[in-house]
Amino acid sequence: APTSSSTKKTQLQLEHLLLDLQMILNGINNYKNPKLTRMLTFKFYMPKKATELKHLQCLEEELKPLEEVLNLAQSKNFHLRPRDLISNINVIVLELKGSETTFMCEYADETATIVEFLNRWITFCQSIISTLT
């Protein structure tokens, strides 16, 4: 059974992940971003289901294309280089989803834009955080 300290740690990690994803979304949505149109042509896979921490496997599998798109943006709106931002997210995701179980991610048939993709995972984080608090 999860202890209050492990629940608190999970909550803090989710809040950190949420902030990183929101920072990326804000950087992309910035009205001064001239590459937004091009960025929206890149398609991302959306999870069929995202209700548990193990479903973060679906986010982990999309970090590689996310990094590519962020490199394309080369935006001053991000405080960190894409490499470091993605590294941070990767570390949090690995800790949250755990490495004990191998979960096969299932994706929805329809692909999404980077904005839709980020919004989906932001909603996921907010939803899990709300169940923990």
Epitope: F42, K43, Y45, E61, P65, N71, D84, S87
Partner: antibody, heavy 125, light 107 residues
């Protein structure tokens, strides 16, 4: 100019291990990732895995997971690929290759623009 | 894993012919698709990346097109040195995968 020079051919027995080296020159070694690709006789190209020369981050093909280890030695600008528990179907020409895009990648771009000359590894009893 | 299929597996053509090779992915990969040429006894050579970007130094008779799951490599006028095996590769998601290859031989 960019060069990737690989170690010479190897003949190994089933169950043994092989370690292929790949010495890079002509560019900043730590700014690019290295992929390993092989081609078995009569087969197509098979992606084996990738290593970041910047931070040692690796990604391996699922079918080789547990048998393959990729490493780098930044002091000598050399990449290594070790394959263990060799089987006869591991007989192939092994290539090291450099990423097209550079420094900013955590995951590697995946596009390969420079290749080593290839190392033939023969697994036979 | 993302699977790639190529067609045809073998193609017989003559010098000067226009040649088209298809590559289909099991899931959307655009624009993360590359094309390589592999001649016997040599290392593979990058021709096209990002589905349609011509690699520096590659002749303009080579071109790439497509998006989503369907991609095409076109050689507008086949030259003697173009007889080789051609592979598509997706680099969208790990593990990166190659297609089975299309061998272009002399008719």
């Amino acid at each position: 100019q960019v060069q990737l020079v690989q170690s010479g051919p190897e003949v190994k027995k089933p169950g043994a291990s092989v370690k292929v080296s790949c010495k890079a020159s002509g560019y900043t070694f730590t700014s690019y990732g290295i992929s390993w690709v092989r081609r078995a006789p009569g087969q197509g190209l098979e992606w084996m895995g990738w290593i970041s020369a910047y931070n040692g981050n690796t990604n391996y093909a699922q079918k080789l997971q547990g048998r393959v280890t990729m490493t780098t030695d930044t002091s000598t600008s050399t990449a290594y690929m070790e394959l263990r528990s060799l089987r006869s179907d591991d007989t192939a020409v092994y290539y090291c290759a450099r990423d097209l895009q550079s420094p900013t990648y955590y995951y590697g771009s995946g596009v390969i623009d420079y290749w080593g000359q290839g190392t033939l590894v023969t697994v036979s009893s | 894993d993302i699977q790639l299929t190529q067609s045809p597996s073998t193609l017989s053509a003559s010098v000067g012919d226009r040649v088209t090779i298809s590559c289909r992915a099991s899931r959307a990969v655009s624009p993360w698709l590359a094309w390589y040429q592999h001649r016997p006894g040599q290392a593979p050579k990058l021709l096209i990346y990002a589905a349609s970007s011509l690699q520096s130094g590659v002749p303009s008779r080579f071109s790439g097109s497509g998006s989503g799951t369907d991609f095409t490599l076109t050689i507008s006028s086949l030259q003697p040195e173009d007889f080789a095996t051609y592979y598509c590769q997706q680099y969208r998601s790990y593990p990166f995968t190659f297609g089975p290859g299309t061998t272009v031989d002399i008719r």
